[in-house]
Interface confidence: low
């Protein structure tokens, strides 16, 4: 009976989310494998988040809007492990917007989700950021490694969206 009510709850939750995401990919989690964590298909999952790589070339603002429409934000990178996971799925000759910007050009970088900007957990390429006119951050492959670079926000780039996993 308990299992039956859990299944009914899950199904109703799934129906609710299907309005927004036509397809979800779910995996069993938790110590009793009773919880399901889901990401929209074809998003990828890492720890408690889902990631989507958009190959549409858009300005930073349009890229953030594009993520918002999908219930996400431009990616906020919190650890080296997270960055390493994300970059496995990126093309080395492309650049991708991050959810990191410096709106006034005062070198006050801020994440879109208001996560505090921690200088000790940043992955800028050598010599970056290097221009107060370049107020948005991208991740790209340079000098044999992935890192961040400040670029102009209006210039179209690909982008990475991130959202919390859906638990049902």
């Amino acid at each position: 009976n308990f299992m039956y009510s859990k299944t009914v709850k899950r199904l109703s939750k799934l129906q609710e989310y299907q309005q927004y995401y036509p397809s979800l990919t779910c995996v069993m989690e938790g110590k009793d494998m009773e919880d399901w964590s889901c990401c929209p298909t074809p998003w990828t999952s890492f720890q408690s988040s889902c990631y989507f790589i958009s190959t549409v070339m858009q300005s930073w603002t349009k890229s953030q809007n594009n993520c918002s429409v999908m219930g996400a934000d431009l990616v906020v990178i919190n650890t080296k492990e997270e960055q390493d996971f994300i970059t496995q799925n990126l093309k080395i000759n492309s650049a991708y917007f991050l959810g990191l910007s410096d709106p006034k050009g005062w070198r006050h970088w801020q994440w879109v989700d208001q996560t505090p900007y921690n200088k000790n957990v940043t992955f800028w390429h050598s010599g970056e950021p290097n221009s107060p006119d370049e107020r948005c951050a991208i991740i790209n492959f340079r000098s044999e490694e992935w890192g961040w670079n400040d670029v102009h926000c209006h210039v179209p780039q690909k982008s990475i969206c991130k959202m919390k996993k859906i638990y049902i």
């Epitope: 390429h125 006119d133 670079n149 102009h152 210039v155 780039q157």
Partner: antibody
């Protein structure tokens, strides 16, 4: 196959006006910033103007600001350069160019060029 | 505005000779691109993002550099390499080209 074909170059008197066109094909035109670059008779390359993918932002060097206007028609895959108050130093071969698909941008395709001569 | 100075402006090389063309920026930059132009044709992308060869560029060409100093090197000059070479930078919102290096065959 990506193709950029410029047209409209001519002999114009100082102070005159002229409009150049660039017909693009073989790629999604509206996905790219587009550029005009000129080459002087002394073989120096100079950028003249560029325009954002939707046409809402335009950029010019001080040498042509206020005299040249770049525009685009995404429905017709065409780039334009309206030039006015022309000077003898505007004499050059004018190239239409596209930037590479990803940062850091370089000019991956160029047209064959169209020649402008400003002389009385 | 960043100024790009190419040297030499004109140079001649014998077939099989190693050739190096340099591009000096007036302040430190992150990238440099190179174009080749032959008489009567439009410039062609040759080396992009410092060291990546554009499609169809022979492996005898290489690019290197950092900061304010960048170079294009031909390991062994061939007749078809005679051309003008330009370095280029996009330092938003300005696009800058070097003055060009005219490479001739000796």
């Amino acid at each position: 196959e990506v193709k950029l074909v410029e047209s409209g170059g001519d002999l114009v008197q100082p102070g005159g006006s002229l409009k150049l066109s660039c017909a693009a094909s073989g790629f999604t035109f509206s996905d790219y910033y587009m550029y005009w670059v000129r080459q002087t008779p002394e073989k120096r390359l100079e950028w003249v103007a560029y325009i954002s993918y939707s046409g809402d932002s335009t950029y010019y060097p001080d040498t042509v600001k206020g005299r040249f206007t770049i525009s685009r028609d995404n429905a017709k895959n065409t780039l334009f350069l309206q030039m006015s108050r022309l000077k003898s130093e505007d004499t050059a071969m004018y190239y239409c160019a596209r930037h590479s698909p990803s940062f850091p941008y370089y000019f991956d395709y160029w047209g064959q060029g169209t020649a402008l001569t400003v002389s009385s | 505005e960043i100024v790009l100075t190419q040297s030499p402006a004109i140079t001649a090389a014998s077939l099989g000779q190693k050739v190096t063309i340099t591009c000096s920026a007036s302040s430190s930059v992150s990238y440099m691109h190179w174009y080749q132009q032959k008489s009567g044709t439009s410039p062609k992308p040759w080396i992009y993002e410092i060291s990546k060869l554009a499609s169809g560029v022979p492996a005898r060409f290489s690019g290197s550099g950092s900061g304010t100093s960048y170079s294009l090197t031909i390991s062994s000059m061939e007749a078809e390499d005679a051309a003008i070479y330009y370095c280029q930078l996009w330092n938003y919102p300005l696009i800058t080209f070097g003055g060009g290096t005219n490479l001739e065959i000796k």
